[in-house]
């Protein structure tokens, strides 16, 4: 019996065709993805062949305008017209808090939305019983499927689970839930999640039962043979791990954004066990032609945001660098912009001492989302700003102690190299780290703006002294494991929102032209 | 246990109103849609229309958007219909359903109106 | 407004036959059809949604398919408390609209 897995993951609001790079689209023949494209493909593979499914596997939410101003409807929308069969829940999913997947996604949604580890207590277990489930079993052709889901633990650290969800050990919570679809005679088990290709592959080395694994989370690109653009494959699709129990388990992603879609083949023998498995990822090009109804619905529902996003804020006339690539790994214009403006925001107090009251900024790497491509006429929208600031964020004020900041910029590069998103950009600090030393040992230099000056200069950081800092509200409350900073601030103001920041900053200067100027070294 | 009960039968006099009730228990009643479909003998069924516990928000059948409104109480876990300005052709039973996954999952027993002088 | 166009709108079937109602739609409705049963005087009973998924306790001779705009509903054994009227309803776009109904009775 063979069974076809069309699979998507971290879309993070890609609903309209992007440019390569997945940032915003500006020559149409030659962009990629969107959903009126997947729901071509998608309806071709169904016509073709009898026993398909349609897995979502997290990260819906969160990453442009349209979750910006729709908040999630649109995702229940669009992954309803589509026809999904099931979701995971990924860990932006909880970007709003509970209430902003409940209300949206959860009880509009026309599939099962899965995941096995996370558990409600309190007032909340009874509010959002039956709204996820551990696992679906679902009917396909004359067989049935079951699908277990699992979310990242880390998601408190990442999110706005708020405190009445409890993020269990994935493998811990899957195991018991996979026993119990083998004991309704449940023999084809697909696990579905969103806690990265590490945890997919352990996932299936050590849970009993797991025939698939379907995975999310570390935006990982597989492919055999030659890749189709610019994504190198982390290994082979599918990735075959062998399990502790001596199965061969097929782990597959699909990279991110609605770029591809994944798609595997699996044969299972009649004891449901997995004979073969081949597929690739499907490369959405305009070689495949959007849906017309699905265009045309997209572009009913795009009015609200042209209002809310079109007009222009102002001009780069070079090309702002926010991708991955770099802010996770070096001093990246986009951060350096970025920063700039979080200081310019804070511009007041200033007296015949101080020549203003903050001088220093950090902005997690991780939290810059996209590039902003200059050859569109130099043209920036706040459309274009809140797929670089896509969490709907506050740059906050903080006052930390000298030994704090050291700590940060340790952790910044503790596991440096990983594409991790707590490596810091900065603004009014000049950082030299020996990546050659211990991690927790690797700050060698690290400089700070006065501000007490009339003319600014850089001194080094004083273990001893109170500094004001501005920050994302993601870091001042300990995100990307910046527990340091939660736990020893000693004071949090909290500040304007974070795309209006930029955005404001970007109307004020007209033009910009940020450069990779030698702050991080 | 999920129940959806409905007040009892009503016989009102044309022209009235009335309202029917739909008490849910069992489950979160804010995490799931309520919807009333209208069975009568000459038109079978019919969709009146939806609404969301947690908020009020409503959505109808814009052949009912002059005839029903629905609302809720939170706090006693009610659905509420109101029917206005009732005809003969308004003699029917209504029935309240919880929706998941936008379909329905459990109704309730039903509640008959008989419109008559 | 979809149209939904249920046959037969009445059958007569012998225990342990295999019946098969269809509803034919007016416009694709991607998959997004439920059937259910109502006994006289009792209120309805949701059997199906997605066209294919059994509600849990349902018996398992009973199933759906389709897709776009043709579904069927099928009970493969037919056994006597199976006797009722059965329908179909969309609920792809808003309004939701029902079939007429099949009326099943005992050979």
């Known amino acids: 019996w063979e069974l076809t897995i069309l699979h998507t993951n971290d879309v993070h609001s890609r609903l309209e065709q992007t440019s390569e790079d997945s940032s915003k689209c500006v020559n149409a023949s030659r962009c990629m993805g969107g959903v009126a494209r997947l729901f071509t493909k998608v309806q071709q593979i169904r016509r073709a062949e009898p026993n398909v499914l349609l897995l979502d596997a997290g990260d819906q939410y969160q990453g442009t305008i349209w979750f910006t101003v729709y908040k999630g409807a649109e995702v229940a929308h669009f992954m309803n017209a589509l026809r999904y069969d099931a979701m995971a829940l990924g860990n932006h999913e909880f970007d709003n808090g509970v209430e902003g997947l409940i209300e949206p996604l959860l009880k509009e949604a026309k599939f099962p939305i899965l995941s096995a580890n996370i558990k409600a207590k309190g007032p909340l277990a009874s509010q959002i019983s039956g709204l996820y489930l551990p696992y679906k079993v679902l009917p396909v052709g004359d067989e049935v499927v079951g699908i277990v889901g699992y979310t990242s633990k880390e998601t408190p650290f990442l999110s706005n689970p708020g405190t009445n969800l409890v993020f269990e050990d994935e493998i811990t919570a899957l195991q018991p839930e996979v026993d119990k679809l083998k004991t309704l005679n449940v023999n084809k088990i697909i696990a579905l999640g969103h806690s990265g290709f590490e945890t997919d592959k352990l996932i299936a080395q050590k849970v009993r039962g797991v025939d698939v694994v379907v995975g999310g989370h570390s935006n990982t690109f597989l492919y055999t043979g030659n890749p189709p653009s610019k994504e190198v494959p982390a290994g082979k699709y599918p990735f075959i791990v062998t399990s502790d129990d001596g199965r061969k388990v097929p782990v597959v992603q699909a990279y991110a954004f609605g770029k591809y879609l994944g798609y595997l083949k699996i044969e299972f023998d009649e004891r449901g066990n997995v004979i073969s498995s081949h597929g690739n990822p499907i490369l959405l090009n305009s070689s495949i032609p959007e849906d017309p109804s699905i265009k045309a619905d997209i572009n009913k529902w795009r009015i609200k945001l042209d209002n809310y996003s079109t007009q222009e804020l102002g001009k780069t006339i070079v090309y702002l660098d926010g991708s991955s690539q770099s802010c996770r790994f070096r001093e990246c214009n986009m951060g350096n912009l970025i920063c700039d403006a979080m200081i310019n925001n804070n511009l007041r107090h200033a007296d015949e001492m101080f020549w203003n009251h903050v001088s220093m900024c950090i902005l997690n790497g991780g939290g810059i989302r996209s590039p902003i491509d200059e050859r569109n006429n130099g043209t920036i929208t706040w459309e274009n700003l809140a797929a670089v600031l896509p969490f709907g964020g506050t740059f906050d004020l903080v006052q930390l102690k000298g030994s704090t900041l050291k700590k940060a910029f340790e952790h910044s590069v503790h596991r440096y190299g990983q594409s991790t998103g707590e490596f810091l950009q900065v603004g009014g600090i000049h950082v030299v780290y020996d990546l050659s030393r211990k991690p927790g040992d690797r700050v060698v230099k690290l400089d700070v703006l006065c501000t007490k000056c009339r003319v600014p200069s850089y001194d080094p950081l004083k273990m001893d002294e109170i500094y004001k800092v501005i920050l994302p509200n993601f870091l001042a409350n300990g995100g990307d494991g910046f527990q340091m900073i939660k736990d020893e601030l000693l004071r949090h103001d909290s500040g304007d929102q974070d795309i209006n920041v930029v955005s404001t900053y970007i109307s004020k200067m007209k033009v910009i032209y940020p450069a990779v100027e030698g702050r991080i070294k | 246990e999920v129940q959806l009960q409905q007040s009892g039968p009503e016989l009102v006099k044309p022209g009235a109103s009335v309202k029917i009730s739909c008490k849910a228990s069992?489950?979160?009643?804010?995490?799931?849609?309520i919807h009333w479909v209208k069975q009568s003998h000459v038109k079978s069924l019919e969709w009146i229309g939806r609404?969301?516990?947690?908020?009020?928000?409503?959505t109808y059948n814009q052949n009912f958007k002059d005839k029903a409104s629905l609302t809720v109480d939170k706090s006693s876990s009610t659905a509420y219909m109101e029917l206005h300005s009732l005809t003969s052709e308004d003699s029917a039973v209504y029935y309240c359903?919880?929706?998941?996954?936008?379909?329905?999952?459990?109704w309730g027993q039903g509640t008959t109106l008989t419109v008559s002088s | 407004d979809i149209l939904m166009t249920q046959s037969p709108s009445s059958m007569y079937a012998s225990l342990g036959e295999r019946v098969t109602i269809t509803c034919k739609a007016s416009?694709?409705?991607?998959?997004?059809l439920t059937w259910f049963q109502q006994k006289p005087g009792k209120s309805p009973k949701t059997l199906i949604y997605?066209?294919?998924i059994l509600v849990d306790g349902v018996p398992s001779r009973f199933s759906g398919s389709g897709s776009g705009q043709d579904y069927s509903l099928t009970i493969s054994s037919l056994e006597f408390e199976d006797m009722g009227i059965y329908y179909c309803?969309?609920?792809?776009?808003?309004?939701?609209?029902f079939g007429a109904g099949t009326k099943l009775e005992l050979k």
């Open positions: 416009q694709d409705i991607n998959t997004y």
């Open positions: 309803l969309q609920y792809d776009e808003f309004p939701l609209t």
């Open positions: 609404i969301n516990p947690y908020n009020g928000a409503t």
């Open positions: 069992g489950y979160s009643f804010t995490g799931y849609y």
């Open positions: 359903a919880r929706f998941h996954y936008g379909a329905p999952d459990y």
């Open positions: 997605r066209a294919n």
